[in-house]
């Protein structure tokens, strides 16, 4: 494994970088006095950016608003005012810019309409915002238009009257397919799932809602659930929380066939004040948070089996506030199996935890080398790194950004943190890991905004300050050495960094405003780093790296979820372009199975510090409350089930006698006789 970035490295300056960047810095001053700016990228690798500025004056009875729309097709170097394409209409910022999936080039802007109008108004573009068509709607939208992930011509929207409206021709014509709808979502294959209230309202009927499905955009319907509190989609799983018969508790039910059959999840039931939350889900499994009773601000993380039915306790005292709905749970996308989150200790302090094996085991983050433990630490030489994420941001702890990782910048994680026994209220620093969270180093002193460019070839940062700024910092060696570039002589009040999603671009836009006595002027500076990374990377610029390697002598070194991966990674010393077409090169190899590759099946558990699954004593000889596919089920098990996504082969196979566990289905949720189909007449 490559070592963590060194702080005391002798940093060489890149030759002529100031001249190279000066020639590639483009300023655009926006000729308006708007109070807010929102920016959206249209398509992938198109260079098209839309910028919507809004200016609102709340008058006594009505509020006067003005919008301006700008378009760039060169990654933000130049902008053109295209407000005339939307007839100088005031655009409602709460709906944002609805950008179509993939490279569809579709954009929908929702306009403000006068009080007495019959319906709303949208502006639609299907050519990357070159042209817009004004369309008057037969309803007032409550939510942003939602594109079907499979077909960007299919749209759904909820109206202020709780009607579910669908369009099959990118918003040209609309049809109300159902009334009294509370929540609607696209599923796979253009399926729409939605809840409806039967009696009063969405709020009043919470827990008595019905879950419906239409697979043909509203021609026919099927009721797939009753007594519903809420529902959600995650990976290939459809979840519904369902009210119990006898009391006010509710339970999670899971379907993997779009709601045709349901199974009761082996998770604790929750009361009225509690909640369930899907923290992360993929095609293999789901991380589920179950809130603790009372207003504690914490709960338990459970990880599922491949069916989404059997759950293993993963992490206790998981911080998830009920009030603000904040959790620090973060998927580290730069390395498989890695997640970071926060726990709440008995003394109300907050600690960071990391898992490298998809929730199997959690541990503290290793203390960065050469760092001192702060005053939260009981031992000044032994402590760990604590990461600031959503919770710290919500608490305004001087943290401008959440942790950052990118799938194509392998192993890189950047985050604000403090080093001690708990998260501190002192000014945080920025830390970097180049091995997916195993080791860390201080990258920058004090809080910064940061972004990854060229698949990790460049990291860019700007100091978080309440004073105007004019300096951008960048690193070409994964955060070890930093160069500073003055991008303007006139400092600006910084409001945000913008780079194309996906971290493949070499352009960064610095947004902000200048303020004189009476005017505020929006300005953007786009810096292109193409001349810093002058040449394309070649074979010699890359080196092999074994992910998750902690013990190079062990034949199982690097094995996570049954396989190991060797990556080709850019050498820190190489200053070259990965390029827009860069594909992460990895070589997977399967590992032999061990008990670590299996979770305990229903009715079994692993005693602390043990690797074998034993039958739960309270279940011996009892009929278990369990419901598979909505009916009584005879379940056979040997007590083990392979961890979702685990690819191990050979080695240990936990063979033991197969038991027949007689299950009693206690959920009257949707036994098949209750399911009914309807046509939309």
């Amino acid at each position: 494994r490559r070592g963590a970035p060194a702080e005391d490295q002798d940093c060489g300056r890149l030759p002529d970088f100031i001249a190279k960047l000066t020639n590639n810095t483009h300023q655009h001053v926006f000729d308006d006095l708007s109070g807010s700016v929102s920016l959206s990228w249209v398509g992938d690798s198109t260079g098209v950016i839309l910028v919507l500025t809004t200016f609102q004056v709340p008058l006594v009875i009505v509020s006067f608003g003005q919008s301006k729309l700008y378009r760039s097709e060169d990654y933000g170097k130049n902008f053109k005012d295209i407000t005339n394409l939307i007839n100088n209409t005031f655009i409602r910022t709460e709906f944002g810019m609805a950008i179509g999936p993939e490279n569809s080039g579709k954009v929908i802007l929702t306009a403000e309409v006068s009080g007495g109008s019959r319906g709303g108004r949208v502006f639609r573009s299907s050519d990357f915002a070159k042209n817009f068509v004004q369309t008057d709607l037969p309803f007032h939208p409550l939510t942003q238009m939602m594109y079907s992930p499979q077909n960007s011509d299919y749209l759904l929207a909820l109206s202020t009257e709780n009607g579910l409206w669908v369009s099959k021709n990118f918003g040209e014509k609309w049809e109300e397919i159902h009334k009294a709808v509370c929540l609607a979502k696209w599923g796979p294959n253009n399926i729409i799932f939605f809840t409806t209230h039967v009696n009063g309202s969405c709020k009043a009927d919470l827990g008595a809602l019905e879950l419906w499905r239409t697979s043909d955009l509203g021609k026919t319907f099927k009721t797939i659930g009753v007594k519903i509190y809420s529902f959600g989609l995650g990976g290939r799983f459809l979840f519904a929380s369902v009210m119990a018969d006898k009391d006010t508790t509710r339970r999670i039910h899971v379907s993997t066939d779009q709601g045709d059959t349901w199974s009761m999840a082996q998770l604790p039931s929750v009361g009225q004040e509690q909640f369930y939350s899907i923290l992360a889900a993929n095609e293999d499994m789901v991380f589920m948070h179950v809130d603790e009773p009372g207003d504690t601000g914490f709960g338990t993380i459970f990880t599922s089996d491949d069916r989404g039915i059997v759950y293993s306790k993963s992490l206790d005292r998981h911080l998830y506030t009920t009030t603000g709905g904040e959790t620090d749970f973060t998927n580290v996308t730069s390395l498989r199996g890695v997640y970071i989150t926060s726990t709440l200790s008995e003394d109300n302090s907050i600690q960071s935890m990391i898992t490298f094996d998809q929730g199997g085991r959690w541990e503290h983050l290793r203390k960065p080398e050469n760092s001192k433990c702060d005053a939260t630490a009981k031992n000044k030489n032994e402590c760990s790194l604590h990461i600031h994420a959503s919770y710290s941001i919500s608490q305004k702890l001087n943290v401008p950004m959440a942790p950052l990782s990118e799938p194509n910048a392998v192993g890189i994680v950047i985050a604000h943190g403090s080093v001690g026994d708990a998260i501190s209220v002192m000014v945080p620093d920025v830390y970097i890991s180049d091995d997916g969270g195993y080791s860390w180093a201080k990258m920058l002193e004090g809080p910064h905004y940061y972004t990854i460019l060229d698949s990790g070839g460049i990291i860019v940062a700007i100091e978080h300050s309440n004073r105007p700024i004019n300096v951008i910092k960048f690193s070409t060696d994964e955060g070890q050495c930093w160069q500073s570039y003055v991008f303007t002589q006139e400092p600006i009040y910084f409001t945000g960094l913008a780079s194309e999603p996906g971290a493949r671009s070499m352009n960064i836009s610095i947004w902000g405003f200048t303020e004189s006595f009476i005017t505020r002027q929006w300005v953007s500076y786009t810096v292109d780093f193409k001349d810093i990374l002058e040449r394309n990377c070649e074979e010699d610029d890359y080196t092999t790296w074994l992910a998750h390697s902690t013990d190079p002598g062990d034949y199982k070194d690097g094995c996570i979820l049954g396989y190991k991966e060797q990556f080709l990674r850019l050498r820190k010393s190489s200053v070259c372009q990965n390029g827009r077409d860069y594909v992460v090169a990895k070589q997977p190899s399967v590992c032999p199975c061990s008990l670590e590759d299996f979770l305990c099946d229903f009715g079994y558990f692993r005693p602390e510090n043990a690797s074998e699954c034993v039958e739960q004593p309270e279940l011996k000889g009892h009929e278990l409350e369990f419901c598979l596919y909505g009916k009584e089920e005879h379940l056979t098990t040997n007590g083990y089930r392979k961890i979702p996504g685990d690819k191990c082969q050979g080695g240990m196979n936990p063979a033991r006698e197969v038991k027949d566990l007689k299950k009693k289905c206690t959920s009257n949720f949707l036994n098949p006789t209750k399911q009914n189909s309807k046509s939309n007449s």
Epitope: G297, D374, K396, L397, G420, A422, S424, V425, V427
Partner: antibody, heavy 129, light 107 residues
């Protein structure tokens, strides 16, 4: 009763270092944090940093980072504050103050601040050539 | 860092009268605020913590209020021993910062 007794006045030359001590009594020394605060002549109060006497870990204000070192000796229930590379602007009265709340961020139950409830009598440090 | 601004800089009050001192934070400090009294040649003394809770041994004429960015220290009936300089201090975000102080003098 709970008290903090500081060392006597010091006169130092620019560039030198000064080490001020603060002896705690009347409570469990390792159970609560200690802050250092200074006050230049005719000026207000300025926080310098905090030490956790249990393990000796510290957090300093950015302004003093690199120049200040806070340590403790549990056998004598004493904390020390050393300031190096002294300049004339460092002429001030230096106080130690018990600071029970520490610096940990809090969960949803919210952080509660108990203030600096016990102060030393102050140590005058004069920096003059 | 959070800037604490106290007003007025000087307050002239007659004994027995009410004194109201203000403290404003540049951003929310929630209720992580303390008030101190300092007399010439002495160390500061804690009066109020948690924005509104009186410290041990502090007379009931001292009261603190406020939350977020605006705080008030009220001395309901000034006694001769109350003429001093008063400081507010935040401990929501490091570094801890103090206001510039309000000097309460005899009118």
């Amino acid at each position: 009763q709970v008290q903090l007794v500081q060392s006597g006045a010091e006169v130092k030359k620019p560039g030198a270092s000064v080490k001020v001590s603060c002896k705690a009594s009347g409570y469990t020394f390792t159970s609560t944090y200690m802050s250092w605060v200074r006050q230049a002549p005719g000026q207000g109060l300025e926080w310098m940093g905090i030490i956790n006497p249990y393990g000796g870990s510290t957090s300093y204000a950015q302004k003093f980072q690199g120049r200040v070192t806070m340590t403790r000796d549990t056998s004598t229930s004493t904390v020390y504050m050393e300031l190096s590379s002294l300049r004339s602007e460092d002429t001030a009265v230096y106080y130690c103050a018990r600071d029970p709340s520490g610096i940990a961020a809090a969960g949803p139950a919210s952080r509660y601040y108990y203030g600096m409830d016990v102060w030393g009598q102050g140590t005058t440090v004069t920096v003059s050539s | 860092e959070i800037v604490m601004t106290q007003s007025p800089a000087t307050l002239s009050v007659s004994p027995g009268e009410r004194a109201t001192l203000s403290c404003r934070a540049s951003q929310s400090v929630s209720s992580n605020l303390a008030w101190y009294q300092q007399k010439p040649g002495q160390a500061p003394r804690l009066l109020i913590y948690g924005a509104s809770t009186r410290a041990t041994g502090i007379p009931a004429r001292f009261s603190g209020s406020g939350s977020g960015t605006e705080f008030t220290l009220t001395i309901s009936s000034l006694q001769s021993e109350d003429f001093a300089v008063y400081y507010c201090q935040q401990a929501r975000l490091g570094p801890w910062t103090f206001g510039g102080g309000t000097k309460v003098e005899i009118k």
